[in-house]
């Protein structure tokens, strides 16, 4: 279930975790049902709060993603402190509305209070039904 | 369903602008992609541009770049292609359809776009 993510930030992340994605195959994202993520990140700063953002970007068009909850603290326990690792486990309710497509670039980012935490580009996904 | 109707289109000279317009009969802002396609006769339907819902990003086709300029109105439920340096290439018939992947139910009628001298 380990997927290969490019890091967009300075190598925090440790793994990528999605069920039933594997390395750098196509990883896909089902309309109207739920998808699941699992990452672990090592925190490069002290931080109390810790947000989500995720853009996806579909046949190269950047679009919103929405139902996402960006506190990332309802799915870790913050504070973080500096050098240590944390498991975040996050699910997305894809809604049924979705864009279909097979080219789909997705890039999740973790902020901390002084910036960047943890930021990762998934570029093998694709929605379908 | 959602019906959408394109209107806007005409005869106009190489050089000239047109402004087309693409009314839906429903909210589109739940849409998170919309696009403008065209069709000459004997080619394949192509994409001319698309625009996301809520942040307004948009994506055009290399022919059309610096030309046209797509844009939508939630609360109005309409989309607009603006069509400025139009040029004989652009004669098409355009529609309107949800990006990326178009739903045949959605293809209305188009709108006829002719440049010509």
């Known amino acids: 279930d380990q997927v290969d993510v490019k890091d967009c930030a300075n190598h925090e992340i440790k793994k990528v975790l999605v069920p039933g994605c594997h390395g750098s195959e196509p990883c896909i994202i089902h309309r109207g049902k739920p998808f699941q993520l699992e990452a672990v990140f090592e925190a490069n700063q002290n931080t109390k709060t810790a947000k989500i953002e995720i853009k996806a970007s579909i046949d190269g068009l950047e679009v919103d993603v929405p139902g996402i909850d960006p506190n990332a603290c309802h799915y870790m326990k913050c504070p973080l402190v500096k050098g240590q690792q944390y498991d975040i486990k996050y699910t997305w309710n894809v809604p049924k509305i979705a864009p279909k497509s097979e080219n789909v670039v997705v890039t999740v980012k973790v902020m901390g209070d002084d910036g960047v935490l943890a930021c990762a580009i998934a570029t093998h996904a694709k929605i379908r039904d | 369903q959602v019906q959408l109707v394109e209107s806007g289109g005409g005869l106009v000279q190489p050089g000239g602008s047109l402004r087309l317009s693409c009314a839906a009969s429903?909210?589109?802002?739940?849409?998170?992609?919309m696009g403008w396609y065209r069709q000459a006769p004997g080619k394949k339907r192509e994409l001319v541009a698309a625009?996301?819902?809520?942040?307004?990003?948009?994506k055009y086709a290399d022919s059309v770049k610096g030309r046209f300029t797509i844009s939508r109105d939630n609360a109005e439920n309409t989309m607009y292609l603006q069509m400025n340096s139009l040029k004989p290439e652009d004669t098409a018939v355009y529609y309107c359809?949800?990006?990326?992947?178009?739903?045949?139910?959605?293809w209305g009628q188009g709108t006829q776009v002719t440049v010509s001298s």
């Open positions: 359809n949800v990006f990326p992947r178009p739903v045949q139910g959605y």
């Open positions: 625009i996301s819902s809520a942040n307004t990003r948009t």
């Open positions: 429903r909210s589109i802002d739940r849409f998170p992609a």
